[in-house]
């Protein structure tokens, strides 16, 4: 038996993956334990199994088929069961009924580019992954730009409120080492969170031209 | 939908080993919960052993526990059983499973199966 505050979290990515993580208080030490997902209109069902992340909680990936496959609608609720084994019979516990369009969070985004660099500017692309079609352009993007002697968490947010899927970084310092990333989030879903932060994409500006004010 | 194919079955003696492969296409592997069955001549198709998505959990039917070992290579696309310390009556068509619900695995009617391996134990 498990004792202990327990909490169970899932989230679309849109196409057909629901990433779960479950923290538990009570220690379950070798315990085996799934997450266990009931469509209400569809006739598949899936299964993932739970592995630890860190010493109370676990995760698991509900792939639910091709990276690029739509599984789930707006009107789709999925029931998701964390079970674990007892001996050899199943006990529920956590579960919840999941609004998948409710709980968002997207793959981060991918391929960021630099397509032009000068002394004190760059512009930067980059493309969204795995993000369904029914967004249409209801979008917005978070980049974060990390200057030489600062964190990321002291880099500045920039918003982009729209599907914008490219930036143009002003003041930059001419001859200087940048790194730059991005994230995304749907505007629908009262629990949608953000994106991961894309892979870090480093650049450079270019030197100040010898015997002229930059 | 996913697609399955069994190799490595054959005549072996009785306390010999065999290792069966499962090569799996078609669809995102890591998606499956895999397992092998077996049936012999006569009988009913039967649950030998499955291993979870990410191998990390396995079960067995009591008759092959200590002997036999089911395991995946995620980056392969195959389930492995292997065989050991044969038995005669473990001769059998061997077939390998897969079931996106792990709860359903053993439930015959529920999976996705290959075409079978036979394996031969002599006495």
């Known amino acids: 038996a498990v004792n202990g505050t327990s909490q169970f979290t899932c989230f679309y990515n849109s196409r057909a993956n629901i990433s779960c993580v479950w923290s538990q208080d009570g220690a379950l030490q070798d315990t085996s334990c799934q997450v266990h997902a009931w469509p209400d209109r569809r006739r598949w069902n899936q299964t993932c199994e739970l592995l630890p992340v860190s010493q109370a909680s676990w995760a698991c990936n509900l792939i639910l088929g091709a990276p690029d496959s739509q599984k789930l609608t707006t009107v789709d609720i999925v029931t998701l069961r964390v079970l674990c084994r007892e001996g050899v019979r199943w006990r529920v516990m956590a579960i919840q009924d999941f609004k998948p369009f409710e709980n968002l969070r997207l793959m981060a985004p991918i391929s960021l580019q630099v397509v032009h660099v000068e002394t004190h500017r760059c512009n930067i692309s980059w493309e969204i992954s795995q993000a369904s079609h029914y967004f249409e352009r209801h979008l917005e993007f978070e980049a974060r730009t990390l200057s030489p002697g600062h964190t990321w968490e002291e880099a500045p947010l920039l918003t982009l409120k729209q599907k914008q899927e490219w930036i143009c970084l002003e003041t930059l310092t001419p001859d200087t080492q940048y790194e730059f990333q991005v994230r995304v989030k749907p505007l629908q879903g009262e629990f949608t969170t953000w994106s991961p932060w894309s892979q870090p994409l480093a650049f450079r500006t270019k030197p100040a031209a010898l015997g002229k004010d930059t | 939908e996913v697609q399955l194919v069994e190799s490595g079955g054959g005549l072996v003696q009785a306390g010999g080993s065999l290792r069966l492969s499962c090569a799996a296409s078609?669809?995102?592997?890591?998606?499956?919960?895999m397992a092998w069955f077996r049936q012999a001549p006569g009988k009913e198709r039967e649950f030998v052993a499955s291993?979870?998505?990410?191998?990390?959990?396995?079960d067995y039917v009591d008759s092959v526990k200590g002997r036999f070992t089911v395991s995946r290579d995620n980056a392969k696309n195959t389930v492995y059983l292997q065989m050991n310390n044969l038995k005669p009556e473990d001769t059998a068509v061997y077939y390998c499973?897969?079931?996106?619900?792990?709860?359903?695995?053993?439930?015959?009617?529920?999976?996705?199966w290959g075409q079978g391996t036979q394996v031969t134990v002599s006495p």
């Open positions: 291993v979870t998505d990410s191998g990390r959990t396995t």
């Open positions: 078609g669809d995102v592997f890591v998606r499956y919960t």
């Open positions: 499973a897969a079931n996106t619900d792990y709860f359903q695995i053993k439930s015959l009617d529920r999976n996705t």
